[in-house]
Interface confidence: low
């Protein structure tokens, strides 16, 4: 086997190994992208839930304040 | 230039391209992992905020219910 052939076979081996490595990385990246997108969806859903809770909180706080004022008025004898 | 040498040069070209593709995928995977971990932190923080908001909501709802009952009682007795 000539040096050139040996070098070529070495290159072919490297090429095969690199292809496998590249394919593994592609799979890994795809899986990670899928996981990232799922997480992004979860985060968006959480942000939406948080917004709704904040609105509910504000609404409840307003109603509580109004009710507290009503209690104060009633206690003072103002119907 | 012999066919073997040409083939070898072609292999080297492919090897270079694959190496860069592999390196780029490695970088992409690393960046994606970092982004994923940041997103995971964000999600955990959001979940904690959501828990706190839910507790505040329950507390406000209880206080509103209690205040509403107080209003009803006072109205019955005073007006």
């Amino acid at each position: 086997v000539t040096g050139t052939q040996e070098a070529q076979e070495g290159l072919q081996g490297q090429l095969g190994a690199l292809r496998r490595e590249r394919d593994q990385l592609e799979t890994q990246t795809r899986d990670l992208e899928a996981a990232y997108n799922n997480l992004l969806r979860d985060k968006s859903a959480l942000e939406e839930e948080k917004r709704q809770l904040e609105q509910e909180n504000e609404d409840l706080a307003r109603r509580l304040e109004s009710s507290s004022e009503e209690v104060t008025r009633l206690r003072r004898g103002q119907c | 230039v012999t066919g073997t040498q040409e083939a070898q040069e072609g292999l080297q070209g492919q090897l270079g391209a694959l190496r860069r593709e592999r390196d780029q995928l490695e970088t992409q995977t690393r960046d994606l992992e970092a982004a994923y971990n940041n997103l995971l932190r964000d999600k955990s923080a959001l979940e904690e905020e959501k828990r706190q908001l839910e507790q505040e909501n329950e507390d406000l709802a209880r206080r509103l219910e209690s205040s509403s009952e107080e209003v009803t009682r006072l109205r019955r007795g005073q007006c």
């Epitope: 072919q12 090429l15 095969g16 292809r19 | 066919g3 073997t4 040409e6 083939a7 040069e9 072609g10 292999l11 070209g13 492919q14 270079g16 391209a17 860069r20 593709e21 780029q24």
Partner: antibody
Framework: EVQLQQSGAELMRSGASVKLSCTAS????????MHWVKQRPEQGLEWIGW????????EYAPKFQGKATMTADTSSNTAYLQLSSLTSEDTAVYYC?????WGQGTLVTVSA | DIVMTQSQKFMSTSVGDRVSVTCKAS??????VAWYQQKPGQSPKALIY???YRYSGVPDRFTGSGSGTDFTLTISNVQSEDLAEYSC?????????FGGGTKLEIK
Amino acid sequence: EVQLQQSGAELMRSGASVKLSCTASGFNIKDYYMHWVKQRPEQGLEWIGWIDPENGDTEYAPKFQGKATMTADTSSNTAYLQLSSLTSEDTAVYYCNPFVYWGQGTLVTVSA
Amino acid sequence: DIVMTQSQKFMSTSVGDRVSVTCKASQNVGTNVAWYQQKPGQSPKALIYSASYRYSGVPDRFTGSGSGTDFTLTISNVQSEDLAEYSCQQYNSYPYTFGGGTKLEIK
């Protein structure tokens, strides 16, 4: 010497199928991904996809899914491209290439 | 799909001049870009891979540069045999895509 010999020009009827061949000499196709590229008259190049002759793995451009089928026969060192349901849009020169070397191309003409 | 835009369809130059053919990617493709030369009536020939690496046997007057979205093929000391169409290709993500090509005319 490294060479890619592609099959001769084809004149096809609309709706027919055609199978083009690309035979390599001077290197082993198993060591390369074989790409196929389309070039319509006076237009740019369009990547169809690649086949890894070693294991038959393929990657197609979405545009050519269902239109093109790439196969390879390592015993004859030949890659094939089959085009189905031909229309005038398929009239083009089709090149095989392992990224570096390109075949001379095969002209496919589709007539109504 | 990533769109590779070669805004100049034709470029005119003289023997001995220096000319730059540009290619713009619609999104980041790193350095995963190849350049091809296609002379009239011939098959394309690979000149550059990984944006800046010359294939063996390609004269050193051909130089590739760029990364991300902007890429350039520079031909210094243009020769009459450089009359051809030059196309870029990204192989960063599937489907691989080519630019529309730039035809170099020699005055």
